[in-house]
């Protein structure tokens, strides 16, 4: 069971990143699915290595002073959402913005029907060029 | 099937990084090989988690003004090369240069004879000290 | 065999990071254990994918001029410690400090009783907020 999906620009104002089965994507079988273009949902309980990579372009003057943060989050059936992993990068002084990449990854127990998704502080700063922003998992 | 190889400084002007089976490297068996010191080639079709880490030292005045980009690329038999993953970092203002690290990783389907390699915008900026720059894969 | 542990602030002056089985941690069975809150120790020989993520907050005026370095290290029974992976980031100019994240990961052969741990140049700069700093492994 494995998946690797590709970032998709979105006009939605939500902080949850959007993904698509496009380009060189992976969706091994129907035991993992991409739902609503925003979350990877698994049908089998078990340990999964889950990862995300986000490239973004920001500038410290144009942004709020808070850093850019990417969060890998979990929603299990009947449970509250919870943060699994986060990473942060301070904004660049490049103009109009400077590129930076964040990588997240870890091993987590997922229940049947559990979904994982990626949140960022400012989706408008995310880079959607080939290979720069992606999200996936693999069952151990 | 798994491999982990270590970066090697090269006098070649190519943007493709060079690797070696040295230090604490991994080469599980002959179903994955390091070819010409530049690419990991697999004999078996399947899903692989492929990763690379590149540490580099750059300065925005001494460098071209473009960001440092690392790309994980795929060459399948009879196919064009394609980019699997990329990451970028804007240059530092540290003198003579500032260290930064990039990590790439994802799950991809590889065909028999497929090769993966790592490209960077400026190989002369790559840090080859112990543990800083490496490349590997594992079959799921 | 898999583990994922969460960073813990420590009053110790050691450069070795401290970890805990808290929050959304993973400890699959007793074939991997967290020892003294500082190292993951495995009982079975084999290939492991080992990873660490460290988020830190530093400022180039307040810090030494040397970059922040995170190292993934190995101690095998009867052997000297050795560095498996390292990553570096130059300090930010943000005030009072700028957040940055480092991710390390690779495939390594571990012997029975081998331990892996994470070293940083300045533990006081590490960010221990939910999800920012973690450490884990999985057996292939």
């Amino acid at each position: 069971i494995a998946a690797h999906v590709i970032s998709e620009a979105s006009s939605k104002t939500t902080s949850v990143l959007q993904w698509a089965e496009k380009g060189y994507y992976t969706m091994s079988n129907n035991l993992v699915t991409l739902e609503n273009g925003k979350q990877l949902t698994v049908k089998r309980q078990g340990l999964y290595y889950i990862y995300a990579q986000v490239t973004f372009c920001s500038n410290r003057e144009a942004s709020s002073q808070a850093p850019f943060i990417a969060s890998l989050c979990l929603k299990s059936p009947g449970r509250f959402e919870r943060i699994l992993l986060r990473a942060a990068n301070t904004h660049s002084s490049a103009k109009p913005c400077g590129q930076q990449s964040i990588h997240l990854g870890g091993v987590f127990e997922l229940q049947p029907g559990a979904s994982v998704f990626v949140n960022v502080t400012d989706p408008s700063q995310v880079s959607h060029g080939t290979g720069f922003t992606s999200f996936g998992l693999l069952k151990l | 099937i798994a491999a982990h190889v270590i970066s090697e400084a090269s006098s070649k002007t190519t943007s493709v990084l060079q690797w070696a089976e040295k230090g604490y490297y991994t080469m599980s068996n002959n179903l994955v090989t390091l070819e010409n010191g530049k690419q990991l080639t697999v004999k078996r079709q399947g899903l692989y988690y492929i990763y690379a880490q590149v540490t580099f030292c750059s300065n925005r005045e001494a460098s071209s003004q473009a960001p440092f980009i690392a790309s994980l690329c795929l060459k399948s038999p009879g196919r064009f090369e394609r980019i699997l993953l990329r990451a970028a970092n804007t240059h530092s203002s540290a003198k003579p240069c500032g260290q930064q690290s990039i990590h790439l990783g994802g799950v991809f389907e590889l065909q028999p004879g497929a090769s993966v390699f790592v490209n960077v915008t400026d190989p002369s900026q790559v840090s080859h000290g112990t543990g800083f720059t490496s490349f590997g894969l594992l079959k799921l | 065999i898999a583990a994922h542990v969460i960073s813990e602030a420590s009053s110790k002056t050691t450069s070795v990071l401290q970890w805990a089985e808290k929050g959304y941690y993973t400890m699959s069975n007793n074939l991997v254990t967290l020892e003294n809150g500082k190292q993951l120790t495995v009982k079975r020989q084999g290939l492991y994918y080992i990873y660490a993520q460290v988020t830190f907050c530093s400022n180039r005026e307040a810090s030494s001029q040397a970059p922040f370095i995170a190292s993934l290290c190995l101690k095998s029974p009867g052997r000297f410690e050795r560095i498996l992976l390292r990553a570096a980031n130059t300090h930010s100019s943000a005030k009072p400090c700028g957040q940055q994240s480092i991710h390390l990961g690779g495939v390594f052969e571990l012997q029975p009783g081998a331990s892996v741990f994470v070293n940083v140049t300045d533990p006081s700069q590490v960010s221990h907020g939910t999800g920012f700093t973690s450490f884990g492994l999985l057996k292939l």
Epitope: K95, C97, Q99, H128 | R60, I69, T90 | -
Partner: antibody
Framework: QVQLVQSGAEVKKPGSSVKVSCKAS????????ISWVRQAPGQGLEWMGW????????NYAQKFQGRVTITADESTSTAYMELSSLRSEDTAVYYC???????????WGQGTLVTVSS | DIQMTQSPSSLSASVGDRVTITCRAS??????LNWYQQKPGKAPKLLIY???SLQSGVPSRFSGSGSGTDFTLTISSLQPEDFATYYC?????????FGQGTKVEIK
Amino acid sequence: QVQLVQSGAEVKKPGSSVKVSCKASGGTFSSYGISWVRQAPGQGLEWMGWISPIFGNTNYAQKFQGRVTITADESTSTAYMELSSLRSEDTAVYYCARSRYYGDLDYWGQGTLVTVSS
Amino acid sequence: DIQMTQSPSSLSASVGDRVTITCRASQSISSYLNWYQQKPGKAPKLLIYYANSLQSGVPSRFSGSGSGTDFTLTISSLQPEDFATYYCQQSDSIPWTFGQGTKVEIK
């Protein structure tokens, strides 16, 4: 040597759209930003927007927001600027230029004259 | 938007003269100020970036100074090929904006 070569002059009717191309050669086009700047006859320079070609990030001047779209094709090293709902005051020479770290524009295309007239 | 005001809007000078053009920003732009030269029918050419860095290939008679809100372009000894229009541009904040230009003419 970096060269930016733009598409030819256009004559357009009010209310229509124009799409100007800018093809780069001789350098790493895709790693840099591309800005679009226009200059009305006898007037000064006006910045319209920016794209980072391989990354896909864009920034637009508020004045043109909703009317201008800047895109890029990494495979052909070409950037595009499309301006819609044209009016007579959009008559100008449109330049593409490569932008670097500090927001300076170091290489410029030769310019494309767009005339909007009924 | 940040307003960029150049002065003078035009000047007459002779070959060998020292020429100074000033550019004032309506708010602080740190050192994110660039200078361009434009000749009739041609695209602008970058002279100075980041307030005082000389662009490669540009003669050393051109220099830039200033930070914050007040900036200066100096041509130490005017040459015949320097008769043109000069623009300053701020790249600190979106939208990037240009000064209205200073035309340097032959006296």
